[in-house]
């Protein structure tokens, strides 16, 4: 099964699970759970690229990232298929594959991905801003359709010629930023008990001030941690979590796949994940979004009150102490 | 300050098909995901889909309610998605609306929503 890798988002530990487990929970075991990869969902991915050397052909590679089976691929450019798009190439595992110019050489690279060049000559040829679809229809899964088009930043002048894509490039530094982050954490951590270990262990003596001060400094340095820690959310590699589709739909195409087997067999609908997600009836708006990102599989975006710096109840003072402000 | 206007909406015929647009327009250079939701009359708002940009990859989900119907594209260059509607029901009746988010959701803009009326 080829899945999407995700790094979720970091997110502070949730107050109630918090409180349940005191204060002394450091965040740096949930900081690891939420870096464990998870596998997507049913996904389509369309990659656009212009040839450096010849500036009128295009290589159009398309992957489906499901556990299904690939019963039919239809590649076409202009916009959807259904929607005024004109079909370049239609793929199929076992009857072959029929391209149409300009479409110059149709393949299968893997058997969820495919890939297209286009020759790029005369009326016909492909311009810049075109936009290319590929139509995937998958047993169980269904039908899954998505478009492309060449980036903005792309100057074929400059760019190198085509390497195998690398499907989380682009998401590198986001990721090597929250490792680092998380390595500075560790560090500063590790620092912070040290420092506690080598302490000097402190005389009893009468206290002048308030019964809660020593409360406040013995637990300083892991709030302190905790704070350090607390990233603000962070979208690496976000992944909707659709559910999967209950019927295949097959494209038409051309006459001679008329004979096609429909496939119409049904996925038992089991809970999706995101399904219990409470969403407000009524509240804030910030509310409301989270619950429709946390649906949806995002994360939501964090701007309401939710994320605080002090989990504990009595706020921002009880820093104070050896790493607080006085 | 970056805005998301939705347009395309209005009747339609069960069984019919309609484009919404979705374009984001000032700050928007870096706008890394665009979707839509949708809210019927007396529901939560729901995911419909979404496309994401990464580098020259497109990377496009349904929620499960699409079954094939929808179609979701759009262009990075230009800020714009689109949701093309195929054999629409009476079900399909709600408002949608656009999202756009940049990277690590410093930009997160919504537009104020299209109305999309399916009649039987």
């Known amino acids: 099964m080829r899945t999407e890798a995700q790094v979720p988002a970091l997110q502070p530990p949730e107050p109630g699970l918090e409180g349940a487990m005191g204060h002394r929970t450091l965040v740096l075991p949930w900081v690891l759970l939420t870096l464990c990869v998870t596998a997507g969902t049913p996904e389509v991915w369309v990659q656009v690229r212009m040839e450096a050397t010849e500036l009128s052909s295009f290589t159009i590679r398309c992957g489906f990232l499901g556990s299904g089976s690939i019963s039919l691929v239809t590649v076409s450019w202009g916009g959807p298929n259904g929607a005024g798009g004109t079909t370049l190439a239609v793929l199929h595992p076992e009857r072959g594959i029929r391209q149409w110019a300009p479409a110059r050489q149709a393949r299968w690279e893997t058997q969820s991905s495919i890939s297209l060049i286009l020759e790029g000559s005369g009326a016909s040829s492909p311009c810049a801003n075109t936009t290319f679809c590929c139509k995937f229809a998958s047993f169980p899964e269904g039908s899954w359709e998505a478009c492309g088009s060449l980036p903005p930043s792309s100057d074929p002048g400059l760019s190198a010629p085509p390497t195998p894509a690398p499907i989380l490039r682009a998401d590198l530094a986001g990721i090597l930023g929250v490792s680092g982050v998380l390595l500075f954490g560790c560090v500063y951590l590790l620092h912070l008990l040290r420092r506690h270990k080598h302490r000097p262990a402190p005389r009893l003596q009468p206290s002048r001030t308030s019964p809660q001060a020593p409360r406040a400094r013995a637990w300083a340095p892991s709030q302190a941690s905790q704070a350090a820690l607390h990233v603000p959310y962070a979208t690496i590699n976000t992944s909707c979590r659709p559910a999967t589709l209950d019927t295949a739909h097959p494209h038409g195409g051309p006459s001679w796949w008329a004979s096609l087997p429909t496939h119409a067999a049904h996925r038992p609908q089991g809970p999706a994940a995101w399904a219990s997600t409470p969403i407000p009836a009524r509240g804030s708006f910030v509310s409301v979004e989270n619950g429709l990102y946390a649906q949806a599989g995002e994360r939501p975006p964090h701007t309401g009150p939710g994320l605080t710096l002090f989990p504990d109840p009595r706020g921002p003072r009880a820093m104070e102490g050896p790493l607080g402000v006085r | 300050e970056v805005q998301v206007v939705e347009s395309g909406g209005g009747l339609v015929q069960s069984g019919g098909s309609l484009r919404l647009s979705c374009a984001a327009s000032?700050?928007?250079?870096?706008?890394?995901?665009m979707g839509w939701f949708r809210q019927a009359p007396g529901k939560e708002r729901e995911f419909v889909g979404r496309?994401?940009?990464?580098?020259?990859?497109?990377?496009?989900s349904y929620a499960d309610f699409v079954k094939g119907r929808f179609t979701l594209y759009g262009n990075q260059a230009r800020n714009t998605v689109y949701l093309q509607m195929n054999s629409l029901k009476p079900e399909d009746t709600a408002v949608y609306y656009c999202n756009g988010r940049s990277r690590f959701n410093v930009i997160n803009a919504w537009g104020t929503g299209t109305l999309v009326t399916v009649a039987s």
């Open positions: 000032g700050r928007t250079r870096s706008m890394y995901v």
């Open positions: 496309i994401k940009w990464s580098g020259d990859t497109t990377y496009t």
